[in-house]
């Protein structure tokens, strides 16, 4: 409940907010959960705490893990957890699902794409914007403050948009990129009984103990904008939020994508530091709308080390 997922790329700045809120004058202490080691507040450190914020300047893959923040108020301490994953930079253009922020939808009248998490950073205009890795050029695209405005939106404008900006900390500059999908609302649409595209029913997913794993639940519900459509994960028949394992979280934003004109949603389940007991759990991908509910079950199995080396 008091845990939030954060992710970033190696050699970029990452700033994480404590999930617990308090007054500006309250002290916030940060710890690396695995070692219970206190995070320093001195800005000369690459990773340091600054009140409600934890700063990785820049981030390294080895920084991945669960961080604990404790907001110290006069009457009690509030504890929160930041589940941080730092990924290696991809050599190709594709942005993987696990690096995507929540999808936004636009129409001819409203086509703002906000740059995710930018409010946490000390940045100055202009923002750079890319679509499917290509720099955006032309009078239809306007970078304004922390968002991109697209004039005369068309169906072809749907895609993955990346914002790039520079975070400045004590005179040093760090690059930050963030990507989210943009969909264009189709006025004509219909809805169907949910169709789960992934995972396959009774799929066995191979994972490595001690590593991170991601499961994507993806389903389509019809064409055009859908009402009351959702995908979610359950563990042993229990909602993720009620299961009480901070290592296992589902991505807050649901990505809405249009595949062959179909409206699809996906929800990523992130398992940090896979443990033996995770292999005993039943993972259910649920897709539901007004027509009903469909469920696909996944189980985890340990990846054979021989397979891994080959």
């Amino acid at each position: 409940k008091f845990s939030k997922q954060s992710w970033g790329l190696e050699n970029e700045a990452l700033i994480v907010r404590c999930p617990r809120q308090g007054k500006p004058s309250y002290t916030v202490d940060w710890y690396y959960s695995q070692t219970n080691k206190s995070i320093p507040t001195q800005e000369r450190n690459r990773v340091f705490a600054s009140g409600q914020l934890l700063k990785f300047l820049p981030a390294a893959v080895a920084d991945s893990g669960i961080y604990t923040c404790i907001v110290r108020s006069p009457t009690f301490n509030r504890t929160g957890y930041a589940n941080v994953t730092i990924y290696k930079k991809q050599s190709d253009c594709n942005v993987p699902d696990y690096l995507m922020y929540s999808t936004v939808s636009g129409s001819e009248k409203n086509s703002k794409i906000y740059c995710p998490t930018i409010d946490l950073y000390n940045w100055t205009a202009p923002l750079e914007w890319f679509k499917n890795c290509q720099a955006l050029q032309g009078s239809r695209y306007r970078a304004h403050k922390s968002f991109l405005v697209i004039d005369n939106v068309m169906t072809e404008d749907a895609g993955d948009y990346t914002c790039k900006f520079i975070h400045n900390e004590n005179g040093a500059n760090y690059s930050v990129t963030a990507t989210r999908s943009f969909t264009v609302k189709d006025e004509q649409g219909f809805s169907l009984f949910p169709v789960i595209g992934a995972p396959a029913q009774n799929e066995i997913k191979e994972v490595e103990i001690g590593k991170n794993a991601n499961l994507t639940c993806s389903a389509c519900f019809g064409k055009g904008t859908q009402f009351l459509a959702a995908v979610l994960w359950q563990l042993n028949g229990t909602k993720i939020t009620d299961f009480g394992e901070p290592r296992i979280q589902q991505e807050e934003g649901q990505n809405q994508s249009f595949s062959n004109g179909l409206a699809c949603l996906d929800m990523v389940l992130r398992i940090a530091d896979v443990k033996e007991e995770d292999l005993l759990l039943q993972y259910d991908c649920l897709a539901l709308n007004l027509h009903g509910l469909r469920r696909h079950t996944v189980r985890l199995s340990r990846k054979n080390p021989i397979d891994h080396h080959s």
Epitope: K1, R17, P19, R20, K23, S25, T27, S73, P74, G80
Partner: antibody, heavy 116, light 113 residues
Framework: QVQLVQSGAEVKKPGASVKVSCKAS????????MNWVRQAPGQRLEWMGW????????TYGDNFKGRVTITRDTSASTAYMELSSLRSEDTAVYYC?????????WGQGTLVTVSS | DIQMTQSPSSLSASVGDRVTITCKSS????????????LAWYQQKPGKVPKLLIY???TRESGVPSRFSGSGSGTDFTLTISSLQPEDVATYYC?????????FGGGTKVEIK
């Protein structure tokens, strides 16, 4: 500049529920909690509860537990306060107030009148 | 709950007078962790929204005239208007900003003689 804009006045019958909204602008909504305070005619201010706008966790005052529900919609930068089982003594002006070192920013207030 | 008791409940003073309002809390509002007193003062004019004057017992909110000052620690606090002005006619509330439930004093109504 920071602005909190609340929904309009409501007239309700005893036993009914009321839901008041508070739309925030001029700052990053999830950076600050949102409090709800009410003031009955000629009475002192009374704190009802607050919500952690980042994770959606509410905390309620003992006098209102079981009757009040505070929620938020981060995509709309809006906080909501719903009060159920209304009685005549719930007639008051309801305010949202942004958390900070005390309440520096308040909504304009929403008058809720409970009358049969 | 922390009880907040204000006195007087009302007062009448002349323009230019020094006005003092006191507020007592049933428990200490001092947080030893940072040595802050979590007490705030608000001004509310008839039919208007409360306005923050002082937080942390003595820190003036930006834009608040310097004639308003706050003092005190622990359980005893004071709001002082050094030279009362006609626009200061209002009800003044102290608030426990220390622990839930945040509680307010009963108010002090200030009028001009």
């Amino acid at each position: 500049q920071v602005q909190l804009v609340q929904s309009g006045a409501e007239v309700k019958k005893p036993g009914a529920s009321v839901k008041v909204s508070c739309k925030a602008s001029g700052y990053t909504f999830i950076n600050y909690g949102m409090n709800w305070v009410r003031q009955a005619p000629g009475q002192r201010l009374e704190w009802m509860g607050w919500i952690n706008t980042y994770i959606g966790e509410p905390t309620y005052g003992d006098n209102f537990k079981g009757r009040v529900t505070i929620t938020r919609d981060t995509s709309a930068s809006t906080a909501y306060m719903e009060l159920s089982s209304l009685r005549s003594e719930d007639t008051a002006v309801y305010y949202c107030a942004r958390e900070g070192d005390a309440f520096a920013y308040w909504g304009q207030g929403t008058l809720v009148t409970v009358s049969s | 709950d922390i009880q907040m008791t204000q006195s007087p409940s009302s007062l009448s003073a002349s323009v230019g007078d020094r006005v003092t309002i006191t507020c007592k809390s049933s428990q200490s509002l001092l947080y030893s962790g940072n040595q802050n007193n979590y007490l705030a003062w608000y001004q509310q004019k008839p039919g208007k929204v409360p306005k923050l004057l002082i937080y942390g017992a003595s820190t003036r909110e930006s834009g608040v005239p310097s004639r308003f000052s706050g003092s005190g620690s622990g359980t005893d606090f004071t709001l002082t208007i050094s030279s009362l002005q006609p626009e200061d006619v209002a009800t003044y509330y102290c608030q426990n900003d220390h622990s839930y439930p945040y509680t307010f004093g009963g108010g002090t109504k200030v009028e001009i003689k």
